[in-house]
């Protein structure tokens, strides 16, 4: 802190502003009958240079000029950007206790003079706006500078505005407080910017608008649609505007989608009709607006209006597939599956379905509502039956879907040949197989159908399956494949009163099992031994088991097991060996192979033959 | 929010002449155009003169046709004062003068356009008797 200067003065020469690589004189300059005593050469004055509060240097080699004990002049050079204190001090060479007393200070500042301010562009934002413009300042001056828009419009009229940049603060746009109205469309206005600190000063060459070129409507407001006569297809979609309005631009898209519906409507008055919507289907509507067919720019867009199209009757053909059960000599379950309709095709809420089983001779009829997806009933054994499912939302149901009730897999000759299940990757299966030999009818369609391998899944779980048309001959099934899981695959061929279908079974993945299968027990029937198991828990199979493997060896032998090699079927849980030596006693023991590989060995049974082997 | 206030008129014989005075107060600024209006019974109200004084010193300055040579327009920024010296008075000069201040929307009449300015002053009437 400087104490209001009572000892003396510091001045500058040429001036405490200076441009960047000028030098300064500092003079130093003490009161009269202010010093360090009645000897004036005993007064000695020093100059320090403080940059952010920090000493950085004592200029005492710097002095050009030294009246003794009265006054001293430094000279500094390569002063930096910015502002730098000095500060003179007092020494008093008599007394060295004492530290320097200050006698006065002075801020150096040192900048460049203003550029020229380039790039202005004004905007008045919707027709009651004001005039706002801005501009490059160029670079950094390091002073206060002062800057001046100025506009100029017809009728010599005139307006300016003022700001300055500083080191706390930016100075590169201005609001006029002026509004341009409408009927001045076809005047040019002109702006400049002037900038002025201590160094000097500058122009901006002069900027020429029209209205047109800077005044930006407001984006419309109030936006709503009304759909006529509860359309799901028609609406029409209103708003308010600014008066001056001629060109609108309308976006409208559904949430989920990545592409905007683009629309201009020209003298559109708050006003407009889509025809092309998709019913029950929730969209996003914008609108911008423009002062002129071909000048001018667009608004921003508006806020977004969000909102559901009505229901319309839903459109599309249900796939339907079915499951035949006989419960006794008379009596079959029939169960009826059906796919959702897609939200395109069901165009609403579906609340129900409507299903039908019509016995085709008798004239029987069987009809219920259900909001489920599937539907089983009881039905005789007897007779020529058909299914019908229809889907129905607030504005009605969609055409009935037909199917004729068949034995799925009654004709051989209908059976599809060569079927093969191989993984493509993580979560699909490639089927292929090749068409019946020698079937009396045409097929009509091929229905690929899947199911996991897991206890229960017949009950639990519905089926999952495609509609193949009769000329292709393979699918790639994906719908709920995981890794590591078995599916039973069967593909159908259909003609118009039979059926007739190969199974086979394929996986996604695989590894090797986890564990091998659980004997449960060993019994000896005519000579021959029967090995028991259990088979391996699901989640443990790791995919479709290909065959098991029985191994069997003396006890205490050091010598390679023997084994025998069953293909795998899920309902066969034991096997017969018999080449065991009676009165021997055997270790034996079971693993299961995937096409990844062998699982370890399961439990181990120790058994010995009584009978005559073979 | 500014407030104007006009004073000086009266009555005078045709070749008179009328000094009229604003007096503006609340958030004065030399910064704006000011401006004098008359309106004569049963006809629109026109612009009559204007003043323009800028941060850069100087100012601009607007007569109607019908008034030049013949009027003047000036302020002292220190009194916040707009003066209208009105010379060779006739009869047509006879109205209601109002003082106003803050050209915030421009039309195409310019500084001439009443709906342009922010601020008015309740009037002073001025009377020319031949």
């Known amino acids: 802190n400087i104490d209001v200067c009572k000892l003396g003065t510091v001045t500058v020469q040429p001036a405490p502003v200076i441009p960047l690589g000028s030098a300064a004189n500092i003079s130093c300059s003490l009161n009269p009958k202010q010093g360090c005593s009645h000897y004036p050469s005993s007064n000695e004055l020093i100059l320090l240079k403080f940059v952010n509060d920090v000493l950085v240097e004592n200029l005492h080699g710097k002095k050009v000029h030294d009246h003794t004990g009265h006054s001293s002049t430094f000279q500094v050079t390569n002063l930096s950007l910015g502002m730098t204190l000095f500060v003179c001090k007092l020494n008093c060479s008599n007394s060295q206790k004492k530290p320097p007393v200050p006698v006065c200070g002075v801020e150096i500042s040192v900048g460049v003079a203003p550029e020229p301010p380039q790039n202005i562009s004004c905007v008045q934002e919707g027709e009651n706006g004001t005039v706002a413009c801005s501009w490059n300042s160029g670079k950094v001056t390091y002073l206060k500078t002062n800057y001046t828009l100025q506009l100029s419009g017809p009728n010599n009229l005139t307006c300016q505005k003022q700001c300055f940049s500083d080191n706390r603060q930016n100075c590169n746009r201005l609001d006029l407080g002026i509004n341009l109205s409408p009927d001045l469309a076809e005047s040019r206005f002109i702006v400049r910017v002037t900038a002025i600190n201590d160094l000097g000063n500058s122009s901006s060459l002069p900027h020429t608008f029209t209205f047109l070129d800077i005044v930006i409507p407001l984006p419309p407001w109030d936006i709503r649609i009304n759909f006529l006569n509860a359309s799901g297809s028609r609406g029409t979609l209103q708003w308010e505007d600014e008066g001056q309005v001629v060109l609108n631009q309308l976006r409208y898209q559904p949430l989920n989608s990545t592409s905007w519906n683009m629309v201009n409507a020209t003298n559109a008055k708050g006003k407009y009709d889509l025809r092309d919507l998709r019913p029950f289907t929730e969209y996003e509507f914008q609108i911008s607006s423009k002062l002129h067919l071909s000048g001018g720019s667009w608004s921003n867009w508006s806020e977004s209006l969000r909102t559901r199209t009505p229901e319309e009757e839903p459109v599309g053909i249900l796939d339907i597939w079915y499951m035949k059960q006989d419960i006794d000599y008379d009596r079959q379950q029939i169960s009826l599956f059906w796919k959702s309709l897609n939200p395109s095709e069901a165009r609403g809420k579906i609340l129900h379905y409507q299903v039908t089983l019509q016995e085709v001779t008798k004239k029987t009829t069987l009809q219920n509502t259900t909001r489920h997806t599937s539907w089983t009933r009881v039905i005789p054994r007897t007779g020529a039956w058909t299914a019908s499912v229809s889907a129905a939302n607030s504005k009605g149901a969609s055409a009935p879907t037909h199917i004729n009730i068949v034995d799925l897999c009654g004709t051989g000759l209908l059976a599809p040949h060569q079927v093969s299940a191989k993984s493509e990757n993580m979560d699909n299966i490639l089927v292929t197989w090749q068409p019946p030999k020698k079937a009396d009818s045409a097929v009509r369609e091929y229905i690929v159908e899947w199911r996991a391998l897991q206890p229960g899944s017949i009950t639990k779980f519905p089926p999952h399956w495609l509609r193949i048309p009769p000329d292709n001959m393979s699918a790639l099934i994906s719908e709920n494949i995981k890794p590591y899981i078995c599916y039973e695959i069967r593909v159908h061929a259909l003609s118009e009163s039979q059926g007739g279908c190969s199974s086979i079974r394929g996986d996604s993945k695989h590894k090797a099992p986890v564990s091998g299968p659980h004997i449960t027990a060993i019994t000896e029937k005519k000579e021959r031994l029967f090995i028991s198991w259990t088979h391996i828990p699901f989640p443990e199979q790791r995919g479709c088991i290909l065959h098991y493997r029985i191994y069997w060896k003396e006890r205490d032998s050091t010598a390679q097991p023997e084994l025998c090699e069953i293909q795998y079927r899920r309902s066969q849980n034991s096997h017969p060996i018999s080449s065991l030596q009676p009165r021997v006693t055997y270790v034996l023991w079971m693993t299961a192979v995937t096409a990844a590989g062998e699982s370890p060995q399961g439990n181990e049974r120790e058994f010995c033959p009584q009978g005559k082997a073979n | 929010q500014v407030q104007l206030q006009e004073s000086g008129g009266g009555s005078v014989q045709a070749g008179g002449s009328l000094r009229l005075s604003c007096a503006a107060s609340g958030a004065t600024n030399s910064n704006r155009h000011m401006g004098w209006f008359r309106q004569a019974p049963g006809k629109e109200r026109e612009g009559v003169a204007a003043?323009?004084?800028?941060?850069?010193?100087?100012?601009?300055?607007y007569y109607a046709d019908s008034v030049k040579d013949r009027f003047t327009i000036s302020q002292d920024n220190a009194k916040n004062t707009l003066y209208l010296q009105m010379n060779s008075l006739t009869p047509e000069d006879t109205a209601m003068y109002y003082c106003?201040?803050?050209?915030?929307?421009?039309?195409?009449?310019?500084?001439?356009?009443?709906?342009?300015?922010?601020?008015w002053g309740q009037g002073t009437q001025v009377t020319v008797s031949s």
């Open positions: 003043i323009y004084t800028g941060y850069t010193g100087g100012g601009n300055t």
């Open positions: 106003a201040a803050d050209l915030t929307r421009w039309y195409s009449g310019g500084w001439r356009d009443p709906r342009g300015y922010k601020y």
